[in-house]
Structure formats: C-alpha cells, structure tokens
C-alpha cells in the first residue's frame, strides 16, 4: 500500500535536482579558480541536510547555515547588482560587465537558480511530486527560506554604490513584497552603503516617460532615505542599446541617453 504523501500546491522538486546541483558546483569551481577549494560533495551533503527529513513548512535560516558556511565567498562589495522581476537582463548585463555580480553569479545563487526542492517530514525522500507554494501553503518552505537567507547575506555584504535593476513594465516597479523589497532593501548596511542607484528598465520602444517619478519608486526612495542611504534613479529607455553599449562603450551612439 503506498504511503500517504502530503500534496502541496506548488511544483515538486526539479527533476535530477541532486545531479544538477553537483554538476553546477563542479562547473562553478572550474570557472572560478578562487572557489577551487570547495568540496562539492560536502556542499551537496549540506544542501540536502537543510531540507531532508524536515517538514517543508518548517524550514529555518538556521537549517541552511552549514551550506552558507561552505559557500562563503568574497565578491567585490562595491560591484553588486540587485534586481527585481527582471532577472534575465540583470544576468545578461553581468555576463558582459564581468566585474559586477548578481546573487546568481555567486556559488550558492548559481547552484539554486531556477530550481525547486523539498523533502518530507521524517523520511529521507526528496518530494518530486509537489512542494509548498509560498502563498497557498506556507512561506517557510525550503526554496523561499534559501533565497531569503542568501539574499540577506548578499545585501549585508554590499558597500559604496549598490545598483538595482527594476522592471518598468510592471504595475509595481518597486514591490515591497519582492525579495528585493522585503529582504535586500532592509539589509543594506547604512554604515557601508553610500548610495542605492535604481535602473528602471523600460519595456516599450516608444516609452519616453520618466519612470523615476513613479509612486513606487518614490516609496523606495523614502524607505532608503529613512535608512540614511542616498538614492538615485536612472531610466534605461532602450535595454537592447544599453547592453550593446556595455559591450562596446566606445561606439559613437553610446554617448546619447539610453
């Protein structure tokens, strides 16, 4: 008789999750020689240990501490790019501007990017059928707690000028409920961070509005200012041209506003 299994509202663990994490770890340590000391077997054991045999609605940041310790990484604190609801462009940018880093350019972010995972209470099984949905089931699920933990640490490490890429096509350009709005904004350290500079990415080709005047951007400015961090904002009217100019800054067309 098959054992009763909790049905959650979200998709189950990504197929081949352990193999994918391991392969990504090996690949990352190959590309980043400064992380060659990392033992990928220990990383997988720590990752697994954070959620296996635990109730997937009762995961804590403490559960991920062994993994956080193994994945400790120094990135240039003044080269951090945060993003909200515009991941692909942020990643395209750091692939070109190699000295800047998103969270997914760090080992732990790279390992977990686009993956889902959860276990079951009191069994060593990985649940490939379903995992808790943040809204419909619970917020303290393995995936949400992981990203909250790594996002907090990433924001805490930032210094000088921190950049954030925001999606100007969304109704809430700045969303207080996003990871950026609920975690990263509140964990920037005023004694280290001088300025948060927002880049608002326009979606429409003929969109010439100043989205830096959007009410949600003003809300972000207010939150940041209250934390004694300066705020600045730029419109990126042509994201395609923006990327092209990052690749070829000497191009004559790159002197005009993008």
């Amino acid at each position: 008789v098959p054992r009763w299994r909790q049905q959650w509202s979200g998709p189950g663990t990504t197929k081949r999750f352990p193999e994918t994490v391991l392969a990504r770890c090996v690949k990352y340590t190959e590309i980043h020689p400064e992380m060659r000391h990392v033992d990928c077997q220990s990383v997988w054991d720590a990752f697994k240990g954070a959620f296996i045999s635990k109730h997937p609605c009762n995961i804590t940041e403490e559960d991920y501490q062994p993994l956080m310790k193994l994945g400790t990484q120094t990135v240039p604190c003044n080269k951090i790019l945060l993003w909200s609801r515009i991941k692909d462009l942020a990643h395209q940018f750091t692939q070109v501007q190699r000295d800047m880093f998103t969270l997914e350019d760090t080992l732990l972010g790279y390992l977990a990017d686009d993956l889902t995972w959860c276990g079951e209470f009191n069994t060593s099984k990985i649940n490939y059928q379903s995992c808790p949905d943040w809204r419909k089931d619970c917020s303290n699920n393995p995936v949400s707690v992981f990203w909250k933990t790594v996002s907090r640490r990433f924001a805490e490490a930032a210094c000088d000028v921190v950049h954030v890429m925001l999606n100007g096509s969304r109704s809430k350009i700045f969303d207080k409920n996003s990871t950026f709005g609920s975690v990263e904004v509140h964990n920037l350290q005023p004694e280290k961070v001088q300025t948060l500079e927002a880049w608002v990415i326009h979606g429409g080709r003929e969109d010439s509005r100043d989205l830096c005047q959007d009410p949600t951007i003003k809300e972000l400015e207010s939150i940041i200012s209250k934390r004694n961090i300066q705020f600045s904002c730029k419109n990126i009217y042509r994201p395609d041209k923006f990327l092209q100019c990052v690749k070829n800054p000497e191009d004559s067309s790159c002197t005009s506003e993008i």
Epitope: C25, V26, T29, V38, I126, Y128
Partner: antibody, heavy 120, light 108 residues
C-alpha cells in the same frame, strides 16, 4: 578515439592500500566536460560505482566507500588515480576506469579492467 | 542488495522483443543509463538519458523511464545480444550513482 588503460599491482595484502592509475590517450583530461570515474565489479557479481574526479580536482565518492577512497588527477601526465585504504578480501574485484558525462552515469569509454586480489 | 531492482534473467527467442526492467524509488526523476556486458569484456554504454542511443548502437535498442520503472527494450533480438545488462541511476537515499543488480539475457 579515447582510450583508457588501468595499471597497478594485481595483489594487495589485507589492511594495505590498493593503488591504481588510469592513463588516458586520444583526448585530454583537461578539456573539461567529463567526469573521470572508477567502477569495480566483484567476481561474478554486478557493478559498483566508486567515485569520480573532474580535471579541476573536484571529486565525488560513493558514500559507502568515502572514508577509504581518494581519487586524484595529474593533468600533466593525462592520468588519474585511485587509492583505497584498509582493504579486505571484500575489495577483491575487477577495477575499471571510465569517462562519464557531467550528469553522471553515462560512462561512454571504459578501460579493459584490472583484477585486484586482496590476499595475504 | 541494490536499490535498483532488475530481474536476474530474461529469456527471449530470436527475432522477438525482450524487455528488461529496472525499478527504484522516484527513478523517473533521474536519468537512467543502460550497459551491455559480454563475458570477459568491459561494459558498453547502449542507452543514456533514458532514451538516447550512443552512435554505433543499433536502433533495435530503445529505452523509457517514468514513475518508478525504466525499461530497456530490444526489438528483433539477435543471438549477439546475449549478454548481461545493467541499469544505473542516481539514488537519492544513497546520494550517489547506483547500478542495478544486472539481468542476464538469454536468446534461446
């Protein structure tokens, strides 16, 4: 065509360390994209995966053997090695080296295997 | 005792279809590979990523994998297919790659 060749002593005394080397020809270990693995087969029995190494030095071992296994790589000689410590008669087997893809399990090139007997 | 279970032996008449199964918990959520091993020889990869054949492997070999069972199917079986067949996949409980116990295919 990639070829793998195992070498090492065919007889090891109990409690000693078994040491084998796999020489790779027809392709470079350093080219990346592959795991270099050790697999063994007890006489008349099935196959058992021991572990792998990537050219960068990253390793992954069968958890049941991890405490006794060390796999190392020498890219300058285009070879990788296996050390299995504290051997017993239960470690008597044909030892194969093989090349596998990064999702593991798909070993497309194998050595011909070398029989290692553990006996005093 | 392997966590991937294969029947110890399968018999088939020449020209018939042989099916060799490999079962394990959540097997369909991991890639399965299959190997053919003739007596005194090294194993040969005949199927990877569930359904893909390496170059040089005849198209009479096919594979499938869903739920808890993977299957290697040999259609139009020939006497030269007589060998031991092993499946291999990642096992979550062991956190490593595991081979099935092997199936001896006899072509009668």
């Amino acid at each position: 065509k990639v070829q793998l060749q195992e070498s090492g002593p065919g007889l090891v005394k109990p409690s000693q360390t078994l040491s084998l080397t796999c020489a790779v020809s027809g392709g470079s270990i350093s080219s990346g994209g592959y795991y270099w693995s050790w697999i063994r087969q007890h006489p008349g029995k099935g196959l058992e995966w021991i572990g792998y190494i990537y050219y960068s030095g990253s390793t992954y071992y069968n958890p049941s053997l991890k405490s006794r296994v060390t796999i190392s790589v020498d890219t300058s000689k285009n070879q990788f090695s296996l050390k299995l410590s504290s051997v017993t008669a239960a470690d008597t087997a044909v030892y194969y080296c093989a090349r596998g893809g990064v999702m593991g399990g798909d070993f497309d090139y194998w050595g011909q295997g070398t029989l290692v007997t553990v006996s005093s | 005792q392997s966590v991937l279970t294969q029947p110890p032996s399968v018999s088939v008449s020449p020209g018939q279809t042989a099916s060799i199964t490999c079962s394990g918990d959540n097997l369909g959520d991991h890639y399965v590979c299959w190997y053919q091993q003739r007596p005194g020889q090294s194993p040969v990869l005949i199927m990877y990523e569930d359904t893909k054949r390496p170059s040089g492997i005849p198209d009479r070999f096919s594979g499938s994998n869903s739920g808890n069972t993977a299957t290697l199917t040999i259609s139009g079986t020939q006497t030269m297919d007589e060998a031991d067949y092993y499946c291999v996949a990642w096992d979550d409980s062991l956190s490593g790659w595991v081979f099935g116990g092997g199936t001896q295919l006899t072509v009668l």
